[in-house]
Interface confidence: low
């Protein structure tokens, strides 16, 4: 299907930039891995990079605005022919939930005074207000709480006293029309306009201040223009070369407003100047090797040694990494593909153990399914052999850090009846639904 | 987006028999499972019977033997066919379906699900006692 194509994805916002047009497919957009596309105007922008998680979005507010609730945020898997940590699609959300508390307590409701005096009536002549208040303290609200109802209340007075009425403009009429529109007739035009002071008219008894200011107004017509004409496009130029070398690029045709040129305030020649068309190199850009994720370390072991794990004997283990993902000529991945170090084997050795301390309380799961959980545990931790941290394996090279490699079998008192983890657990409060916030924006 | 829209409700003696259908547009090469729940007033909404693209089904132990749930891929439509329909049957019959997106999010949580994501407006069935 065609897609709309992009020469930039921000990576701060998630959205695509620099339209390049429309009417291509996935694969012609991505020939160049800096682009963008969207299926549709509006939806979600994918880069043509090789696909990676999102930063995690900031967490939704509260479930609750008082005591315990749970409150969500995700990360979504972005790119293009290929897949995320865990084998995961471009476009997938990965959700995360946790308790959250805004507030411990939840407010309380308080009760009102009785009503004070009534303060004197707001005007001097004529009809007014006049106000008491009461005070929100029997008893006091707590935990940010409030009083139902008003402070205040307020009633009409009427002070018997006649008020004068002040003389205002109404407002000025319209200016009376020029003898022509556009340049030199025989007498020089003008224009008049007039008002009334009727917006009140003052008044009699008591008496009123007549309307300050004259009640005409009187101007030449000035500045009339001569009379337009409107402009005209002339032909269109030639069309720009393509401006890549790789992928697609965009190139333009210009035109002039000047079959005529627009004189005397005549309007500008409708439409636009310029008009792109997408020109495609058929070259694919290239892509530029990035390293995968360093592979397992290999057991540690010694030459000509069968074995030397639970043993004060340093042996060495090594890891690798691939370069994948370079055509077309791109760059190699820089550094080394081998790892090398040295370490001591505890490999199934039976050690001593002592339990840790409660860890935090994990994620609440499944974040998005029915009842979730959140967990922390107490774990057998194996207490270590003070072998030396360092050793110098070859003379002259200086001394080199020493690792524990494997996976010892720790052995701790029974504690609850479990011998290695000891796992508490509880339910989530209050637990707000997953949507996709891609779709709640529509 | 993917529309649901059901059809086949209706008003029926018990013993007898409804056929519902569910038929998808939009976005129809997302979907994944597709499944009927139902409401009965002041009860909690509970899964009938669902069905992987594959074609793997999956009932409520309340309708397993009564109830058989099919999908016709071509026509983007899911069915219920609901046979010796009881008085407890009578429910608001609701289709619902899984975005491919979703499926792989709750495989990655661990979640058996599905994790349905698009909802129909439902269709009422009555059985009268």
């Known amino acids: 299907d065609p897609v709309l194509c992009f020469t930039q994805y921000e990576e701060s916002s998630g959205k695509c930039k620099g339209l390049l047009g429309g009417g291509v497919s996935v694969e012609d957009c991505c020939l160049n891995t800096a682009f963008a596309y969207q299926k549709r105007s509006g939806g979600l922008c994918q880069p043509c990079r090789s696909p990676r998680w999102s930063l995690w979005s900031t967490w939704a507010p509260c479930s609750v605005t008082c005591s315990e609730g749970s409150q969500l945020r995700y990360r979504r898997c972005v790119g293009w022919n290929g897949q995320c940590s865990g084998k995961v699609a471009p476009g997938t959300l990965e959700w995360q939930l946790q308790a959250c508390e805004d507030q411990q307590c939840c407010p309380e409701m308080g009760g009102w005074s009785g009503w004070g005096p009534w303060e004197p009536c707001s005007v001097t002549c004529s009809k007014g207000t006049r106000t008491r208040r009461r005070a929100c303290n029997h008893p006091a609200p707590k935990c940010g709480g409030h009083c139902p109802g008003q402070a205040q209340e307020s009633e009409a007075c009427d002070t018997q006293q006649v008020c004068p009425t002040h003389g205002a403009w109404a407002t000025w009429g319209p200016w009376t029309p020029c003898s022509a529109s556009c340049h030199g007739g025989p007498h020089e035009p003008k224009e008049t306009r007039s008002r009334k002071c009727s917006a009140p008219e003052p008044s009699q008894k008591p008496p009123g201040k007549p309307c300050p200011g004259l009640a005409y107004e009187q101007r030449r017509c000035t500045g009339l223009p001569p009379c337009p004409v409107a402009g005209g496009w002339g032909p269109w130029g030639p069309v720009s070369p393509c401006p890549v070398t790789c992928g697609l690029g965009q190139t333009m045709e210009q035109r002039t407003c000047n079959h005529p040129v627009p004189q005397h305030g005549g309007p500008f020649c409708a439409g636009d100047a310029t008009r792109t068309h997408i020109c495609n190199t058929a070259v694919p850009c290239p892509v530029d090797g990035e390293w995968d994720s360093w592979g397992e370390w290999s057991p540690c072991i010694r030459r000509n040694m069968k074995s030397i794990s639970c043993q004060e004997i340093p042996g060495q283990q090594s890891r690798g990494r691939t370069c994948r993902g370079r055509k077309f000529d791109g760059h190699r991945c820089a550094g080394q593909q081998q790892d090398i170090r040295h370490c001591y084997s505890i490999q199934h050795c039976p050690l001593k153990g002592s339990w840790s301390e409660w860890s935090t309380w994990g994620l609440c799961m499944p974040p998005c399914g029915p009842n979730p959980t959140r967990a922390r545990q107490r774990l057998c931790t194996p207490l270590l052999p003070k072998y030396p941290p360092t050793v110098s394996m070859v003379e002259g090279q200086g001394e080199k850090n020493v690792t524990f490699w494997g996976r010892p079998l720790p052995r701790c008192e029974e504690l609850q009846g479990q011998k290695l983890v000891v796992e508490e657990k509880r339910p989530c409060l209050h637990v707000p639904a997953c949507k996709d916030p891609e779709e709640e924006e529509l | 987006q993917v529309q649901l829209v059901e059809s086949g409700g209706g008003l029926v003696q018990a013993g007898g028999s409804l056929r519902l259908s569910c038929a998808a547009s939009g976005s129809i090469f997302d979907i994944n499972a597709m499944g009927w729940y139902r409401q009965a007033p002041g009860k909690q909404r509970e899964l009938v019977a669902d069905?992987?693209?594959?074609?793997?089904?999956n009932y409520a132990d309340s309708v397993k033997g009564r109830f058989t749930i099919s999908r016709d891929n071509a026509k983007n439509t899911v069915y219920l066919q609901m046979n010796s329909l009881k008085p407890e049957d009578t429910a608001v019959y609701t289709c619902?379906?899984?975005?491919?997106?979703?499926?792989?999010?709750?495989?990655?949580?661990?979640?058996?699900?599905?994790?349905?994501?698009?909802w129909g407006q439902g269709t009422q069935v009555t059985v009268s006692g």
């Open positions: 619902a379906a899984e975005s491919i997106r979703e499926s792989q999010n709750r495989h990655q949580l661990g979640y058996m699900g599905p994790l349905y994501d698009y």
């Open positions: 069905i992987t693209s594959s074609g793997s089904t």
